[in-house]
């Protein structure tokens, strides 16, 4: 069973001093943040017993394995059901505490009732404050039964539940008709899944015979020991004030476990600590009684004295629960109550015994759960004891259960049962997860779900290049940390597998499924150099660069050009996807902007060093386009252009530029400057006769503006071939500007 205890402090004079503490003795309990241990949960369960809302309760975590609930402001806050949940995975367990108001109309004679399947359970509610009205019994909040108030027997209302079955388990309450639910008597009924003394899926297995009020768990056959007792069969008493499966916990405060209710995993339920009894666990046991709720009687023989915490304390020469066994009778010594081995191991088990006459090797035997008897292979004889050593054959899962060491001499016999847990080494159910990769390293999360048993003591990561026959490389890592595999080959697939181990010999599990993880490309190392750039318009920039010459193939897939506009805080990235490219045209830039420019080589997703940056100032955008451009042929070699000035000019025009192109021609267009910006017409001369031309123009202030509409016009026929177009603005002749 899970080592989980819910303690309720029942000093009820002041509700603000009331607290509930949940303590886990499980390894790794309550850490929550790691994959191996979910957190302890402690809460009030309002599903069945609903009480008026109050201020929220305060939850405090004390270390990794303890959580405390405080903040109760009034007695009604305490009434109801509280639960603590702890343990991991299939071992996750809920422990329940039911609190009754000491001032209720009806009080339970006994809160927790643990019964076997098929038994008759009797719940008894004692009248504390009488009302002459019906008593209503509920089960898990729903109506269950009614009793007339005359049906009380000796001031008690009884609910008989014959032939109970596990579904009958739950919270029962007895309430006077139309009384507050806070005045109810609340009970907890736990119905074991088997008849008395049996456990297992078909209830075919025999319980170990739990002592001192321990209860046999119907699923695993283990004894759930009362607080203050330990051992496979609860045969051993803890020191006063101690509890937990290994007596490892200590009751808080100077008065030890007085005033505390202990709740343990089902099917135990709740009781006072060892040595205490009463509804508030504040009364010491009467003489001759001991244990949880003082339910046990000492009946000591041969001069033994009764200790209310541990039972009979025997005088020299005697032992046994009632001091009924003489020390002449052989006795098994210091046998561990529980041993743990890994599957398929061949452990050695020691069993020591003393007595008069002295036990010898052949007088000690070991019996497995299936009845097989093992004889010891060797014995170590010391003055006060004989220790027999048994070599156990390869363990299988069926070997889990209660083993027995038995000693027999002419003086009598003794036996000691102990629990052997055969654990299955953990096997990962999933492959490890890749977190990040670089060219020569992989960062891997080894935490995966697994079959078999924990706790996980070590995690081994095995890896080698894919399709390789070379030996696996292995790295041992902390279970809760990510692993970096280093010194790998770039752009290489690696097969990676996890192997988990649990404590003990043979605890290494099989390797988990492989996964393929691929390292990144090698980083490009060459640094480009910006050779030059020139502005091809207010929003266009041509950039050229070079790379240093190095032997061997170029490591790179292309180039990344970056333009940083510091004024606006914007970056423009341009991808050039050929590693052979050494020039690029950047368009759509913002006119009049100061850019910082650099270029980097890239390979896969990795960037090489950036070139030293260059600073580029684009000219501001020019004026709007001239309006109403019109062309008119004057002769076989002259065409007159007329236009209107652009509207909304940002400043004075410095010149106009006319573009002349033969319609349908393949050659480059000619640009002709009109340097007298006040003019609105010009004559283009030197044209070919009977030829169709296309014209458009734009203005310039600091930069060139937008093009006007394109117009077409043909020169007149029968002229001679001209040398080429020239322009005349009114009477002035201007040279050709290409």
């Amino acid at each position: 069973a899970v080592d989980l205890t819910l303690l309720a402090n029942l000093r009820l004079t002041d509700p603000q001093r009331f607290f509930l503490t949940c303590v886990s003795g499980e390894a790794g309990a309550g850490r929550g943040s790691d994959a191996w241990g979910p957190p302890l949960l402690l809460e009030k369960d309002d599903r069945i017993v609903r009480t008026p809302p109050g201020p929220p309760l305060r939850l405090a975590r004390n270390g990794s394995h303890q959580v405390t609930l405080r903040g109760f402001s009034k007695p009604s806050d305490l009434v109801g059901v509280f639960s603590c949940v702890g343990g991991a995975g299939a071992r996750r367990t809920r422990v329940i505490y039911v609190h009754n108001s000491p001032g209720a109309h009806l009080l339970p004679d006994k809160v927790t009732h643990t019964v076997n399947k098929g038994d008759t359970a009797v719940l008894s509610a004692r009248v504390h404050k009488e009302k002459q009205t019906d008593v209503i019994w509920k089960s898990n909040g729903s109506y269950f039964y009614t009793l007339d108030w005359h049906e009380a027997q000796d001031g008690r209302f009884l609910l008989q539940l014959p032939n109970v079955q596990p579904p009958s388990s739950g919270i029962y309450s007895a309430t006077y008709l139309e009384a507050s639910p806070l005045g109810s008597a609340f009970f907890r009924l736990i119905v074991r899944g088997c008849g008395a003394g049996r456990w297992g899926p078909g209830c075919t297995k025999e319980c170990p015979g739990c002592l001192h009020g321990g209860v046999c768990h119907d699923h695993d056959g283990e004894c759930v020991c009362p607080p203050g007792f330990t051992g496979t069969r609860c045969e051993q008493a803890c020191r006063e004030g101690r509890f937990g499966q290994s007596c490892q916990e200590q009751c808080p405060g100077i008065s030890g476990c007085r005033g505390l209710t202990f709740c343990l995993p089902d099917p135990y339920g709740c009781s006072c600590g060892s040595g205490w009894r009463g509804s508030q666990c504040q009364e010491a046991c009467a003489p001759g009684h001991f244990g949880a709720d003082c339910r046990l009687q000492c009946q000591c023989q041969n001069g033994g004295t009764c200790d209310r915490f541990s039972g009979c304390v025997c005088p020299s020469g005697w032992h046994g629960v009632h001091c009924e066994k003489s020390d002449r009778i052989p006795q098994i010594l210091n046998m561990a109550s529980e041993l743990e081995f890994n599957l398929e191991t061949m452990p050695r088990i020691n069993c020591a015994a003393a007595g008069n006459p002295f036990p010898v090797r052949g007088s000690i035997e070991l019996r497995k759960p299936d009845g097989t008897v093992l004889l010891s292979t060797k014995a170590i004889v010391e003055p006060e004891k004989t220790t027999a050593e048994f070599e156990v054959p390869r363990l299988v899962l069926a070997d889990s259960g209660f083993w027995e060491c038995r000693v027999s001499t002419s003086g009598g016999q003794d036996s000691r049962r102990f629990k052997v847990n055969v654990k299955v080494p953990p096997v990962p159910l999933a492959a490890p997860r890749l977190l990040t990769k670089q060219s020569r390293q992989l960062v891997v999360s080894p935490l995966v779900s697994f079959s078999g048993d924990g706790p996980i003591s070590t995690v081994r990561l095995h890896y080698r290049p894919q399709d390789s026959t070379m030996d696996w490389s292995t790295i041992v890592v902390d279970p809760s940390e990510n692993v970096t595999l280093m010194n790998l080959r770039p752009k290489t697939g690696y097969s990676v597998r996890v192997q988990l181990s649990r404590p003990g010999e043979g605890g290494e599990g099989a390797w988990g499924p492989p996964t393929l993880m691929t390292t990144d490309c090698p980083e490009p190392l060459l640094q480009p150099w910006l050779e030059g750039w020139h502005v091809e318009g207010t929003d266009r920039l041509r950039v050229s660069w070079s790379l240093p010459l190095v032997p061997g193939p170029l490591v790179g897939d292309g180039f990344l050009l970056r333009l940083w506009d510091g004024t606006r805080g914007q970056e423009r990235r341009e991808n050039v996807s050929s590693p052979q490219a050494r020039t690029a045209l950047l368009t759509g830039l913002t006119p009049g902007t100061h850019y910082q420019l650099d270029v980097q080589l890239y390979h896969c997703t990795l960037l090489g060093p950036a070139s030293p940056p260059a600073h580029v100032l684009l000219p501001p955008s020019g004026p709007p386009a001239p309006r109403h451009l019109h062309a008119q042929a004057l002769s076989d070699s002259e065409i007159q252009l007329t236009w209107k000035h652009p509207e909304a000019l940002p400043g004075p025009i410095s010149k106009y530029v006319v573009e002349v192109q033969v319609a349908g021609g393949a050659g480059d267009p000619l640009w002709i400057d009109v340097d007298r910006p006040e003019e609105t017409s010009t004559i283009i001369r030197g044209l070919n006769a009977s030829t169709r031309y296309l014209f458009r123009m734009r203005a310039s202030i600091q930069g060139l503006g937008d093009w006007s509409n394109t117009v077409e016009e043909s020169t007149l026929g029968n002229g001679l071939q001209a040398e080429g177009p020239v322009q005349e603005s009114r009477a002035a002749e201007e040279g050709l500007d290409q």
């Epitope: 609903r50 209503i136 729903s142 009614t146 006077y176 008709l177 139309e178 009384a179």
Partner: antibody, heavy 123, light 106 residues
Framework: EVQLLESGGGLVQPGGSLRLSCAAS????????MFWVRQAPGKGLEWVSR????????YYADSVKGRFTISRDNSKNTLYLQMNSLRAEDTAVYYC????????????????WGQGTLVTVSS | QSVLTQPPSLSVSPGQTARIACSGD??????ISWYQQKSGQSPVVVLY???RRPSGIPERISGSNSGNTATLTISGTQAVDEADYYC?????????FGGGTRLTVL
Amino acid sequence: EVQLLESGGGLVQPGGSLRLSCAASGFTFSSYMMFWVRQAPGKGLEWVSRIYPSGGWTYYADSVKGRFTISRDNSKNTLYLQMNSLRAEDTAVYYCARVTVPLDSGSYYFDYWGQGTLVTVSS
Amino acid sequence: QSVLTQPPSLSVSPGQTARIACSGDNLGSRYISWYQQKSGQSPVVVLYQDYRRPSGIPERISGSNSGNTATLTISGTQAVDEADYYCQAWDRSTAVFGGGTRLTVL
């Protein structure tokens, strides 16, 4: 599905006897307190008798005390009302009804009623 | 034994709010249930514990209980609401019924 089915009603002369039955199904009959409630023609509802789940405790309205006996057979899931010394004023539709207690409450209410059986006392 | 008093009849137009009162000595200290009985049918619980509705009962039906009066309220009354309505309380596990109110939807 919870069902209550009354039977045994009919015409009877004053001073005569009649035994009503109520067959219950669809619930754990032995856990519930059961009632007989009657309704005279054109009148309101009147409580007649109640019996506790164990059958050990029974109560009656003053108007029927000493003449009517309520009983139950938990093994047969049946409620009975033995009516003796019948009078004209006992003429009514007789309903058997179950009470329950809701979640979060300690108060009864009638959650299921039978369809009723008519008892006519006349000469 | 306690007595619960109801008006014999109440008439409302469709869509109006109907309020049926049930009075009795210190009624607010007890839980009241209300039952609807349509002509020729068995009673059906419409409210218990003063104001709680069983499943299937429309939200138009609500209740309150304080002082000496418990009230059943039907808002937006419909023709299907035409029936006799009985209040009921408990006197030491003995059921006490009101005389009933016939609700007529005009």
